[in-house]
């Protein structure tokens, strides 16, 4: 059996027989059996600074005599380099200084062998040495700088931020792992609640107006904060965030602008601005007009980029009507935080005063545009209707007239300068132009700077000035066996006039063709005739070709008639009336050619 | 021999929750961290937070608060991580790894797959 | 919070062949209590979890390979491999735990 000098034990074992025992820095409330072995744990402080090996146990067999005939051996993590043991006394030691921030935990195997025979003299036994914690490492910040937002005004304990630290010592064993958390600078500004590292407010009514940037120095310190903790340090950059606590206001109660009578709509004539301490979407400012008798006639628009309120021009301004309006100006915060509404009204206003200025204004015709109508066959120099323009201003200055050339450059129409009548120069023709687009110049005579210009629309009206004609140029075939009274061709006609009732056409026979005539035409009333065989059968070898006159006339007033030529040649034609030949020996002999007769 | 077995891989649908083990072996399970580590398809490795099995310790990578839980059981020395509320973009391995603090994850664990897919 | 870029992303070499890639910080990872950089190099093959290779900047994980070597300090961070070897083929991070913990984007070592 074994046994182990109590001197040497250091953690009071049972006294039990054992095969191989192991005294030292040993504790027995983890030891458990393995196989038949003892399993043992000894604690070895970490960072031993001594200047001798630091003694970890004592290895020892019951059959050691005391005459060096066995020898002791270790092997497994760190023997021979970490750990060392006298191989003749089993005492076993640490070589280095051990972190257990490195390896917490060291699994080695202990011998005892009989040096003759090689042989060991006892199985072989596992222990295991854990370093023990020493409070050897700072608490460090998770960031070197947090930075952080909460909104100014705000209520006191509001959390702002979460700093945590972490310490690398064993956090189950004593504090040297329990970190506390303290504030070094930022009071009475803010609080760390000690145990969480939740940054709070401490101070009721922290204005971003007044203060927007706060620097917090935090402390962590290990040992649960008590004396001899290490302690690390962190920075929290902490910004106030703005809320609506500003009312916006005017620096002045009274603005005037001058803007003359002549801005149209949409012109900008000043800018008014109140200002807003807060800032972003708190230092929003929507102006309208609130009262005043320039409320129609003038607007307020916002300028989003400079929060300016910009008087526009609502409708237009008449110096000879009134020269002065006065407004009244209202800024508001369209964000308001119904919180601080006991602040007061989130709004201010100012006075406007809008002088008009008188302004030597063009002549203006008495119609935007005009339309005027003219029969196409008026005579040169006929009027045809008249525009009138007038001086606005106060002076009412007397005004010529002149027709544009650019606008009618054939000079067709004219005007007189002075009572503004327009009258032709040329003759018009609607089948060549319907519509005549001119501008009318009205000039002040005694200042030609100062012009209008006004459109007129010309329409020329129809008059029934062109004859009718054939649609097409017609030229058709009659078969030899031909029946009396068959249809052979259609005849349509066009007319370039343009009648209000519509075209009327009525066609006939020429009264030289119309007597003993091989053809008849048949007059559809509707703009269309047709010309029938009027006998049964027509030899081509007597008669190739027939040209029938055609008179065409319309039915408006006055008639306009005239005359085309339909040519029907004879040709040879199957059973089916296909036509197969048409011998054109009536181009070359004229005696062949008839009209019809 | 030091061991760390992870649980086998996942298919989950989007939105959806997860929670896979890793079974430590051959030490002391609450002597060291165990951390935790994700690796998507073709990308590097991505830090999620470590857990002190002794006494319940946590620290989370911010990007995963509240997406990852790390807890333990020291009586069968196995971790645990739970991923909540799943996307796509939570498809990759998974790896535990035992370590101390300031040095380095001395041994790993095979890694879990995890595929969120609808 | 802090970043972590790593430079080349990729680059290939003959086996035999000294590599080098660094990592910056956007702040300092050195402790002056404990006089230690918190800077941890980590390997990770094509299909595989990945492998601690060193820690605190320079000190290698039992069983890396002498070859692969830390360097470095505040900002500024190295991996040297004095000779690449056809398993080094991989992706190389580096992670930093001085406030938490954060990755590199990595760094692809091809073989040619």
């Known amino acids: 059996t074994l046994s182990t000098p109590l001197s040497k034990r250091t953690s009071g074992f049972p006294a039990k027989k054992r095969a191989l025992e192991l005294s030292g820095n040993s504790k027995n409330e983890l030891s458990r059996s393995k196989r038949s072995w003892m399993w043992n744990q000894f604690f070895l402080l970490e960072e031993y600074t001594g200047s001798d090996y630091q003694y970890v146990g004592k290895l020892h067999s019951d059959q050691d005599r005391g005459d060096g005939s066995l020898k002791y051996i270790l092997s497994g993590d760190g023997a021979g380099d970490l750990f060392i043991i006298n191989e003749n006394t089993g005492d076993i030691q640490a070589t280095k200084r051990l972190d257990r921030e490195e390896k917490p935990v060291y699994i080695l195997r202990a011998q005892a062998i009989n040096r003759r025979t090689g042989r060991p003299v006892e199985p072989e036994s596992e222990f295991i040495i854990k370093i023990h914690d020493i409070n050897d490492n700072e608490p460090i910040f998770t960031k070197e700088v947090y930075t952080a937002t909460v909104p100014e005004m705000s209520d006191v304990g509001t959390f702002v931020v979460q700093v945590t630290a972490t310490d690398a010592d064993d956090p189950t064993y004593g504090n040297s792992a329990k970190v506390v958390y303290s504030i070094l600078q930022g009071q009475p500004y803010f609080s760390v609640e000690s145990e969480t590292g939740i940054i709070k407010t401490a101070l009721l009514n922290m204005d971003r107006e007044n203060r927007e940037q706060y620097q917090v120095v935090i402390q962590a310190k290990d040992m649960g904060g008590q004396m001899g903790g290490l302690s690390g340090t962190t920075t929290v950059n902490i910004t106030l965030t703005d809320v609506n606590d500003n009312p916006p206001r005017f620096p002045q109660s009274t603005y005037q602008f001058k803007t003359p009578e002549s801005s149209p709509p949409g012109t900008p004539i000043g800018r008014i601005k109140a200002s807003d301490a807060d800032v972003g979407e708190n230092a929003e400012i929507e102006y309208s007009i609130t009262d005043g008798e320039g409320l129609d006639m003038f607007d307020v628009i916002t300028d989003q980029e400079t929060q300016e309120g910009i008087i526009t021009v609502k409708k237009l301004l008449d110096f000879e009507k009134k020269k002065v309006y006065t407004l009244k100006v209202e800024a508001s915060n369209p964000h308001v935080e119904p919180r601080f509404l006991y602040l007061g009204p989130f709004k201010d206003s100012a006075t406007v005063r809008i002088v008009v200025e008188d302004v030597d204004e063009p002549p203006v015709f008495s119609k935007l545009a005009y339309i005027l109508q003219i029969r196409e066959d008026a005579q040169i120099n006929t009027t045809i209707g008249s525009v009138t323009a007038q001086d606005p201003d106060a002076a009412r200055n007397p005004v010529k007239y002149s027709v544009d050339r650019h606008t009618d450059m054939d000079r067709i129409f004219n005007i007189d300068s002075g009572n503004g009548s327009i009258f032709t120069s040329k003759l018009l023709d609607r089948e060549t132009l319907l519509w005549h687009n001119i501008t009318v110049i009205a000039t002040e005579i005694n200042n030609p700077k100062q012009s209008s210009r006004v459109p007129l629309y010309i329409k020329v009206l129809d008059v029934n000035d062109n004859a009718p004609e054939f649609a097409e140029f017609y030229e058709t075939f009659v078969c030899e066996k031909a029946k009396a009274d068959q249809l052979i061709q259609t005849l349509r006609a066009v007319d370039k006039d343009d009648p209000y009732s519509g075209h009327q056409f009525s066609f006939s026979l020429a009264p030289e063709a119309a007597s003993g005539s091989n053809f008849t035409i048949q007059d559809n009333k509707d703009n269309t005739a047709g010309i029938l065989t009027r006998k049964n059968g027509y030899n081509r070898h007597e008669m190739s070709t027939y040209l029938l006159p055609v008179v065409i006339s319309d039915n408006d007033y006055p008639v306009q008639s005239s005359t085309g030529t339909v040519t029907v040649r004879v040709c040879a034609c199957d059973h089916h009336g296909n036509m197969q030949s048409c011998h054109a020996e009536a181009l070359i002999h004229p005696t062949g050619l008839s009209t019809g007769a | 021999q030091v061991q760390l077995q992870q649980s086998g891989a996942e298919l989950v649908r989007p939105g959806t929750s997860v929670k896979m083990s890793c079974k430590a072996a051959?030490?002391?399970?609450?002597?060291?961290?165990i951390g935790w580590v994700k690796q998507r398809p073709g990308h590097g490795l991505e830090w999620i937070g470590d857990?002190?099995?002794?006494?319940?310790?946590?620290n989370y990578n911010e990007k995963f608060e509240g997406k990852a839980t790390l807890t333990a059981d020291t009586s069968s020395s196995t971790a645990y991580m739970q991923l909540s509320s799943l996307t796509s973009e939570d498809s990759a391995i998974y790896y535990c790894?035992?370590?101390?603090?300031?040095?380095?994850?001395?041994?790993w664990g095979q890694g879990t797959t995890l595929t969120v897919s609808s | 919070d802090i970043v972590m870029s790593q430079s080349p992303s990729s680059l290939a070499v003959s086996a035999g062949e000294k590599v080098t890639m660094s990592c910056k910080s956007s702040?300092?990872?050195?402790?002056?209590?404990?006089?230690?950089?918190?800077l941890a190099w980590y390997q990770q093959k094509p299909g595989q979890s990945p492998k601690l290779l060193i820690y605190?900047?320079?000190t290698r994980e039992s069983g890396v390979p002498d070859r692969f070597t830390g360097s470095g300090s505040g900002t500024d961070f190295t991996l040297t491999i004095s000779s690449v070897q056809a398993e080094d083929l991989a992706v190389y991070y580096c992670?930093?735990?001085?406030?938490?913990?954060?990755f590199g984007g990595g760094t692809k070592l091809e073989i040619k």
């Open positions: 605190w900047a320079s």
């Open positions: 051959e030490y002391t399970f609450t002597n060291y961290w």
């Open positions: 790894a035992r370590g101390m603090l300031t040095t380095g994850f001395d041994s």
């Open positions: 992670k930093q735990s001085y406030y938490l913990r954060t």
């Open positions: 857990l002190y099995p002794g006494g319940d310790h946590a």
């Open positions: 702040q300092s990872l050195f402790n002056s209590r404990t006089r230690k950089n918190y």
